[in-house]
């Protein structure tokens, strides 16, 4: 805490300018008027203050706005944003996407800090939903942002926002998240033709049910193995050998290299060896000829 001392004669700040970088901390505290600082916040970021000095300026703003800063000040915080705590940010009401962008810019190129996470949370809650422009902005700064949300939070993403999602934004999503996102993507892209639809929906297919995979197998989509390996195991298991062959097209040969990994391994165990042999890939582990396959899950459902 900076001690309260009178401002030396002739040092009272008339404006926020570069001369202030030569003020000691106590001089900044004594000689810079908080109201002046608030009205000239747009100048602060261009002045090469130390963070030590920025701490003093923050203290002045905190005294002026104990209930939280107005957006006119927040928008121009620049590197002063790095001195804010999540508790400070929880007092803010940030409604402008421009303000959000300005603050994310300060943190650009670095992992998401607790301050940024709190800021985004405040912003999204204030908007009520994760609209397309917001999602566009957030994924531009943090490609992994979408996958950091819980399935419950993802449920507030409107289907229209899905157009902003790039394949790399989903790289770290787990199946529970894709389960929520896939139906939204299906709805968003429903009016596209076959090949265009597949290009868009491909990164979301980790949330697709069996019936949708069966439908895709009828459309000559030639799914690559990387996408196939990310499909839900429970969605792949009921697919026939013929359906998987159609789904993968020329990529079907890749099954051999993946035969020990899920979901391929589990799928092989469910197929008749005869059917697997028709692929000519040497896949082993299918059900031998003459064996009867009982679907116990069906039996349980009937009892």
């Amino acid at each position: 805490e900076v001690e309260k001392t009178a401002c030396p004669s002739g040092k009272k700040a008339r404006e926020i300018d570069e001369s202030l970088i030569f003020y000691k901390k106590w001089e900044l505290e004594a000689c810079v008027d908080a109201a002046l600082l608030a009205t000239q916040m747009d100048r602060v970021n261009a002045i090469p203050f130390t963070y030590e000095q920025l701490d003093v300026l923050k203290h002045k703003l905190d005294e002026l706005y104990p209930q939280g800063y107005p957006e006119s000040v927040i928008q121009h915080l620049g590197y002063l944003f790095l001195k804010m705590s999540p508790e400070d940010i929880r007092k803010w009401n940030v409604t402008s996407l421009e303000t959000l962008k300005a603050l994310l810019e300060v943190n650009k190129g670095h992992e998401m800090s607790p301050q940024v996470a709190t800021l985004i949370d405040r912003f999204v809650k204030g908007r009520g939903q994760l609209d397309k422009d917001t999602l566009d902005t957030l994924t531009a700064f943090y490609p992994g942002y979408l996958c950091s949300l819980s399935p419950e939070e993802l449920s507030s993403v409107p289907p229209s926002s899905i157009w902003a999602v790039r394949p790399q934004d989903l790289d770290t999503c787990d199946p529970r998240q894709l389960d929520v996102l896939y139906p939204k993507a299906r709805l968003a892209f429903q009016n596209m033709n076959g090949s265009e639809y597949f290009v868009k929906i491909q990164s979301f297919l980790g949330g697709a049910p069996t019936e949708d995979l069966k439908a895709l197998s009828q459309q000559n989509v030639s799914m690559d193995l990387a996408t196939f390996m990310k499909l839900r195991t429970d969605a792949v298991l009921p697919l026939t050998v013929a359906e998987v062959q159609k789904l993968l097209g020329p990529h079907v040969e890749g099954l051999k290299a993946e035969e020990r990994h899920r979901p391929v391994r589990d799928w092989i165990l469910r197929q008749r060896q005869d059917d697997l042999d028709t692929l000519g890939l040497g896949l082993q582990g299918g059900i031998p000829n003459g064996y009867l396959v009982l679907d116990l899950s069906m039996q349980e459902a009937l009892s």
Epitope: P48, F49, T50, Y51, E52, Y79, L82, H110
Partner: nanobody, 116 residues
Framework: QVQLVESGGGVVQPGGSLRLSCATS????????MGWFRQAPGKQRELVAR???????MYADSVKGRFTISRDNSKNTVYLQMNSLKPEDTAVYYC??????????WGQGTQVTVSS
């Protein structure tokens, strides 16, 4: 983390000169260039001179015309040439910079004493 090491301090008579050096152990990514600061006993640290990333130099009124800040990028070193030294220049001199993440970095300091 980059280390900052100051050298060149010493005892000098009023009117004398010293050249301080600040060597960095690697390339620094600074938001506000590199600065020379000083702290006299019982006083707060103050900026004396700063050289920005674009080469612009800035000086405190009390040292203008007497001190010169410069840098040699090939040697990762910043200098402070101090001429016409006065007793009130006596202090520990530090070089320092601010990163892009909210932290200030300082060297360990070098003592400058101006005394007859």
């Amino acid at each position: 983390q980059v280390q900052l090491v100051e050298s060149g301090g010493g005892v000098v008579q009023p009117g004398g000169s010293l050249r301080l050096s600040c060597a960095t152990s690697g390339t620094i990514f600074s938001r506000n260039g590199m600065g020379w600061f000083r702290q006299a006993p019982g006083k707060q640290r103050e900026l004396v001179a700063r050289i920005l990333n674009d080469g612009t130099t800035m000086y405190a009124d009390s040292v203008k015309g007497r001190f010169t800040i410069s840098r040699d990028n090939s040697k990762n070193t910043v200098y402070l040439q101090m001429n016409s030294l006065k007793p009130e220049d006596t202090a520990v001199y530090y070089c320092g910079y601010s990163d892009y993440r909210g932290t200030d970095y300082w060297g360990q300091g070098t003592q400058v004493t101006v005394s007859s």
